[in-house]
């Protein structure tokens, strides 16, 4: 299981991504939740679905990157990043993304959880 | 090997509730989501609802929102699918089925199936 | 809700035949379709998942194909023990939807 954990402040913009090259894919998926896509690229197109993430989100179809703008408390939540290899199988790796609010207190606490998980990636 | 061991059959009254059980074993519970599929007797498949039992989040066909309710107990690596105010066209054999990783509902693995009589 | 129309609801053909099941899906669904058999009295059994993946354990003569919304099952040569229930199902997009199912029996 890929499993990272990442600590932002509310209001700031945050990329979501992978440390390792992606494996030759036809299809990668960002949900938000299990059962809730935000964005679907295949060989032909990018494809954004109805959700709150609609309009400040943007993916890099290359690193499979997703950019997520203005990130708000209520964006907590764990996002799957799920790849279709050329294979046929899939792929899936997971971001816990807490989103804290700017007060002195929480963002000490931030750094120190980044610089934790910057240092420890857990796999 | 993965094994999902449901409860046993239920006979129940109209108005009444059940809740079925799905033990997992053979695999980390928390690393795939689980889904509930009903049969009635003679009849196709049926999605009822999902859950991914490292969150909770749910999912649910909206023929069953309100009714019914997708719990799991992680401490147990058990999966619950409890259904209110039963009638007659509830009678039906329901599943358990675990998809493939979270976000891949395709289901390799069933549970055996438990039998649910609602009559009067 | 995505409708997954399959057909024909019942088809009857003789060992050796080659057989084929459609699944017409109400919207773009990808690839995302799997494909099930189902005994009297048994639980599901996964054929085909991603259209045209075979399942682990399943023989070559099942078949998937297809993109967007239309996907074929195919038996390239039909066998006693393939007398079943099939069934498509679309996991593109929630809630799951499975289709009507296809009755296959024996001439």
């Known amino acids: 299981m890929h499993l990272v954990h990442m600590t932002v402040v509310s209001g700031s913009n945050v990329t979501l991504n992978i440390s390792e090259s992606l494996p030759e894919n036809k299809q990668l998926t960002w949900f938000y939740t299990f059962d809730q896509k935000i964005v679907e690229w295949d060989s032909r197109k990018s494809k954004y679905f109805e959700s709150k993430f609609k309009g400040r989100v943007r993916l890099d179809p290359q690193s499979g990157a997703l950019y997520i703008s203005k990130v708000q408390k209520e964006d907590n939540s764990t996002y799957i990043m799920r790849v279709l290899k050329k294979t046929g199988n899939e792929q899936e790796w997971k971001i816990k993304l807490q989103v804290l609010d700017p007060g002195l207190n929480d963002i000490f606490e931030a750094q120190k959880i980044e610089w934790h998980e910057h240092h420890h990636h857990h796999h | 090997q993965v094994q999902l061991v449901q409860s046993g059959a239920e006979v129940k009254k109209p108005g009444a509730s059940v809740k079925v059980s799905c033990k997992a074993s053979?695999?980390?519970?928390?690393?795939?989501?689980m889904h509930w599929v009903r049969q009635a007797p003679g009849q196709g498949l049926e999605w009822m609802g999902g859950i991914n039992p490292d969150t909770g989040d749910t999912s649910y066909n909206q023929k069953f929102t309100g009714r019914a309710t997708l719990t799991v107990d992680k401490s147990t690596s058990t999966a619950y699918m409890e259904l209110s105010s039963l009638r007659s066209e509830d009678t039906a054999v329901y599943y358990c089925?675990?998809?493939?990783?979270?976000?891949?509902?395709?289901?390799?693995?069933w549970g055996q199936g438990t039998l649910v009589t609602v009559s009067s | 809700d995505i409708q997954m129309t399959q057909s024909p609801s019942s088809l009857s053909a003789s060992v050796g035949d080659r057989v084929t099941i459609t699944c017409k899906a109400s919207?773009?669904?990808?690839?995302?379709v799997a494909w099930y058999q189902q005994k009297p009295g048994k639980v599901p059994k996964l054929l085909i998942y991603?259209?045209?993946t075979r399942h682990t354990g399943v023989p070559s003569r099942f078949s998937g194909s297809g993109s967007g919304t239309d996907f074929t099952l195919t038996i390239s040569s039909l066998q006693p023990e393939d007398v079943a229930t099939y069934y498509c199902q679309q996991y593109s997009t929630y809630p799951i939807t499975f289709g009507q199912g296809t009755k296959l029996e024996i001439k």
């Open positions: 919207q773009d669904v990808g690839t995302a």
């Open positions: 991603w259209a045209s």
């Open positions: 053979g695999y980390t519970f928390t690393e795939y989501t």
């Open positions: 089925a675990r998809a493939q990783f979270w976000t891949t509902p395709r289901f390799a693995y």
